[in-house]
């Protein structure tokens, strides 16, 4: 069977939504009303990996686009990017590790930890309109907590 994928949107703990910023970057900003339609809809795939009650391995693609969030080293630093893939081969149950995030939910907090780089998380800045990035600190200035809204296909 193919991998099961469900559509969702994400907001950080300050209620900032994620939108496209150019072809290969996401940014976080507050949206209201009709502007909410700008927010990115992810296709979240439940992929192979170590799983527990609080931790589920997922891949985050952009709905109806052959783009996936991936984690790679750039200048020796773990970096978040949007990577283009062959739509004939993706998504799949056994995703390469750079595409895999551990979706961790504890006490109303949802985090996305890179499987490739443990303790590095999808992060947003406190400031408006800044890029979504991979951050190596939790509980600091940067935001690593999200809420997720599933949406019908």
């Amino acid at each position: 069977a193919p991998v099961r994928s469900l559509n969702c949107t994400l907001r950080d703990s300050q209620q900032k939504s994620l939108v496209m910023s150019g072809p290969y970057e996401l940014k976080a900003l507050h949206l209201q009303g009709q502007d909410m339609e700008q927010q990115v809809v992810f296709s979240m795939s439940f992929v192979q990996g170590e799983e527990s009650n609080d931790k589920i391995p997922v891949a985050l693609g952009l709905k109806e686009k052959n783009l996936y969030l991936s984690c790679v080293l750039k200048d020796d630093k773990p970096t978040l990017q949007l990577e283009s893939v062959d739509p004939k081969n993706y998504p799949k149950k056994k995703m390469e590790k750079r595409f895999v995030f551990n979706k961790i939910e504890i006490n109303n907090k949802l985090e996305f930890e890179s499987a490739q780089f443990p303790n590095w998380y999808i992060s947003t800045s406190q400031a408006e309109n800044m890029p979504v990035f991979l951050g190596g600190t939790k509980g600091g200035q940067d935001i690593t907590d999200f809420t997720m809204q599933f949406v019908s296909s």
């Epitope: 193919p2 469900l6 809420t147 997720m148 019908s152």
Partner: antibody, heavy 119, light 107 residues
Framework: EVQLVESGGGVVQPGRSLRLSCSSS????????MSWVRQAPGKGLEWVAY????????YYPDTVKGRFTISRDNSKNTLFLQMDSLRAEDTGVYYC????????????WGQGTPVTVSS | GIQMTQSPSSLSASVGDRVTITCRAS??????LTWYQQTPGKAPKLLIY???TLAEGVPSRFSGSGSGTDYTFTISSLQPEDIATYYC?????????FGQGTKLQIT
Amino acid sequence: EVQLVESGGGVVQPGRSLRLSCSSSGFIFSRYDMSWVRQAPGKGLEWVAYISHGGAGTYYPDTVKGRFTISRDNSKNTLFLQMDSLRAEDTGVYYCARGGVYKGYFDVWGQGTPVTVSS
Amino acid sequence: GIQMTQSPSSLSASVGDRVTITCRASGNIYNYLTWYQQTPGKAPKLLIYNAKTLAEGVPSRFSGSGSGTDYTFTISSLQPEDIATYYCQHFWKLPYTFGQGTKLQIT
């Protein structure tokens, strides 16, 4: 014994609000995704709301989106459904059920609480 | 969304009979299918998930099979306590939807 008990149903006028509660016992509530499923009189089943075990994930079908809000209090082992702008078609028995988006099925159900929306 | 169509909508059978209910999805649901039993005035009860896995405590006379878009629920030897309405439900894509139900009566 694993148990879910709903309360808060009743008769309400169109456009008004109602808040349902579901009390759980016999299992570790905070470890389970939860849902509300309704059944109109003499009809089938419709999943109307979902919340993840910690409360960070939610889902509503288009029929109730923007009108219903699901929430939970893990410290009190209780699930809630806030129903606003009620319509006649929201009439039915509302069941609290264990399960949701990830697992996909509902393995424990409450006895249901009836909601009637009528002027 | 994916629509689920059950057939028949009602059926009568005798104690000891083999009973079969079918559920057809409007698209491939890859075995992400569940069956429930709802006895009159009661809440639904999970019987089968993942198309063929029996839920805990469910008698072995109940079984499920199928793949793709077509699924079958079978009671190998009907018992009086099986009088109920049976529902299928898929969980492949959101929204997860239920079939309209099959009402089973004893003749």
